[in-house]
Interface confidence: low
């Protein structure tokens, strides 16, 4: 059976295009290429007689075809309108003819596309933003990128109008991009040069660094405050309540208790018209704002009872802070054979008795810190055991 | 109800050529990204081809590259797989996928395979 | 090329009681545009194709059971079943959908002990 193949069936505007032709009959005295699904003589592009090899262009010829003497018809440059189907007939010597019909279907070779955007300056969260790839050509896939990964799945994002327009619902800070579309056919694809959103946001709530809450008088207080923000927030100092300066850092030397007190940092984003405050609280003092903790040393861990006596001492090198003594979870003395001296540094229990036996440790606080040492076991027994003089805790 | 059913399997020797073909229904075959995925006897999953809605993008996995060819024809809503120089190491059962929407992504609906077997 | 390690190779676990599988790829799966892990988790049982599980590292696909959940981010994840149940007894399989490479782990097998 006679047969035509298009070679190739999708074919780039400009490019040329191969009906070729299967099974023909021998006995031939020529054929003719026409132009859709029948012979039509007003449609005849080329004719051609096997006596003479003599090809005689038809009402339909553009001089772009070539008729070889296999029956193949070649056309060169082919435009958009050359697609459709192609008939060949065959006139064989009895007079009988026989027909066969192709097809091929012509693309443009697609442009470098671009993207246009109804708003490049959203504002998060309240504004939505619709790109579209431009042009639209028929028989077109379109795709899009964002950050060279395929669209996530995500009902902020829709695609519409045979997706050449992506919309952003309710954008983020997140959605900045870049964006990229893809245009497809058959023959040919390209992509747009990539476009980013410049999103407006903030003022996040702002930062106060650094996070230091304690200053000895005399050093150099200089806070910086930050908040997430495009445009970039402008910022503000208020201390005590009272407005300071319009800076991010904020630098005041040579502190005094003076400047204890409550420091707000207020950021303002003139786009958005949002405004958000930190307050952070500032204590100078000579205190130190952590005390180390104390080491606690006993002239005897065990001792015989009515007999020794004991000294529990608690060192330590911070200034400005009071001890206090614990056994067994109560605070001492309690009992006048107990006695605290050098400002509570020392403990003496004189003499030792049964009950005085168990743990002691003591605390070093001042008004804003404390920290407590680590126990130590006060053995008493009753009796003569050769004494232990240690200083390692139990 | 989204069906993919995968044909063209059998036995061949290393060396030759096989085509692999996905029959598609339940869905709009040309608005999906699609998949071959293959897995060796007792071995595990791997990647094999992807191809894009309009065909004009593929790309393979390193150990197929310059002799698996992936393509669609979107009338006949079918994919293909043509092997060429094949190995024993592409003995496997191969899978046709489909990402769970129209971009490539993950793999949400399979067929249920066809086996390629490559021995002399 | 993105390369998936998975642990343990097969893990058995006590009807009811917690099964913990891991994956580590070569690179970050974070998209920051998005905030979005790029990892998938399938099971497949015997002489079936593998069932996709979990997308974005911790989206459960529609009908899977709720106890299997995914977590991780950036180049470490984890799929838990927290009471494994006798159909739970499959292979279970990471992969990277960072397109345009697909790259799957080695795979897990749950038995039940």
């Known amino acids: 059976q006679l047969t035509t193949e298009s070679m190739p069936f999708n074919v780039a505007e400009g490019k040329e295009v191969l009906l070729l032709v299967h099974n023909l009959p021998q006995q031939l005295f020529g054929y003719s290429w026409y132009k859709g699904e029948r012979v039509d003589g007003n449609r005849q592009i080329v004719g051609y007689a096997i006596g003479t090899q003599q090809a005689t262009p038809g009402p339909a010829n553009s001089g772009r075809e070539t008729i070889y003497p296999n029956a193949s018809l070649l056309i060169q440059n082919v435009t958009q309108n050359d697609t459709g189907f192609y008939t060949l007939q065959v006139i064989k010597s009895d007079l009988v003819n026989e027909e066969a019909t192709g097809q091929f279907h012509v693309y443009p070779e697609l442009p470098k596309p671009s993207i246009s955007s109804n708003n490049s300056n959203p504002v998060e969260d309240k504004d939505a933003v619709a790109f579209t790839c431009e042009p639209e050509t028929q028989d077109t896939t379109y795709l899009w990128w964002i950050n060279n990964q395929s669209l996530p799945v995500s009902p902020r994002l829709q695609l519409s109008n045979g997706n050449r327009t992506l919309t952003l619902l309710s954008v983020t800070r997140n959605d900045t991009g870049p964006y990229e579309c893809e245009i497809q056919n058959p023959v040919s694809a390209n992509r747009s040069d990539p476009v980013t959103l410049n999103v407006t946001y903030g003022p996040d709530t702002p930062t106060i660094s650094p996070s230091d809450t304690y200053y000895r008088p005399g050093a150099n207080l200089s806070l910086s405050c930050y908040a997430a923000s495009n445009p970039p927030a402008q910022y503000s100092w208020l201390i005590n309540g009272t407005f300071q300066q319009s800076t991010q850092e904020l630098f005041i030397p040579n502190i005094t208790v003076n400047n204890s007190g409550s420091y707000t940092c207020h950021a303002n984003n003139s786009v958005t018209g949002c405004n958000r405050t930190t307050v952070k609280t500032i204590i100078v003092t000579e205190l130190s704002p952590v005390v180390a903790k104390p080491q606690i040393k006993a002239s005897k861990t065990t001792v015989t009872g009515d007999k020794d006596s004991v000294n529990l001492t608690c060192s330590t090198n911070d200034t400005g802070i009071s001890i206090r003594w614990f056994f067994k979870n109560q605070s001492l003395p309690s009992s006048e054979r107990m006695k605290l001296s050098q400002g509570n540094t020392t403990l003496s229990i004189n003499p030792v008795k049964r009950e005085d036996a168990g743990t002691y440790w003591c605390e070093v606080f001042n008004p804003i810190s404390k920290n407590q040492s680590d126990p130590i076991m006060l053995n008493v027994n009753y009796n003569a055991l050769p004494q232990e003089n240690g200083l390692s805790p139990g | 109800e989204v069906q993919l059913l995968e044909s063209g399997g059998g036995l061949v020797q290393p060396g030759g050529s096989l085509r692999l073909s996905c029959a598609a229904s339940?869905?709009?075959?040309?608005?999906?990204?699609l998949y071959w995925v293959r897995q060796a006897p007792g071995k595990g999953l791997e990647w094999v081809a992807t191809i894009s809605v309009g065909g004009g993008q593929t790309s393979y996995a390193d150990s197929v590259k310059g002799r698996f060819t992936i393509s669609r024809d979107n009338s006949k809503n079918t994919l293909y797989l043509q092997m060429n120089s094949l190995r024993a190491e592409d003995t496997a059962m191969y899978y046709c996928t489909r990402a769970l929407y129209y971009g490539p992504a993950w793999f949400a609906y399979w067929g249920q395979g066809t086996l390629v077997t490559v021995s002399s | 090329d993105i390369v998936m390690t998975q642990s343990p190779d097969s893990l058995a676990v006590s009807l009811g009681e917690r099964a913990t599988i891991n994956c580590k790829s070569s690179?970050?799966?974070?998209?920051?545009?998005?905030?979005?892990?790029?990892l998938a988790w399938y099971q497949q049982k015997p002489g079936q194709p593998p069932k996709l599980l979990i997308y974005f590292a911790s989206t459960r696909e529609s009908g899977v059971p709720d106890r299997f959940s995914g977590s991780g981010s950036g180049t470490d994840f984890t799929l838990t079943i927290s009471s494994l149940q006798a159909e739970d007894v499959a292979v279970y399989y990471c992969q990277s959908h960072i397109y345009p490479n697909f790259t799957f782990g080695g795979g897990t097998k749950v038995e039940i002990k």
């Open positions: 339940g869905f709009s075959f040309s608005d999906y990204y």
């Open positions: 690179q970050s799966l974070l998209n920051s545009a998005n905030q979005k892990n790029y």
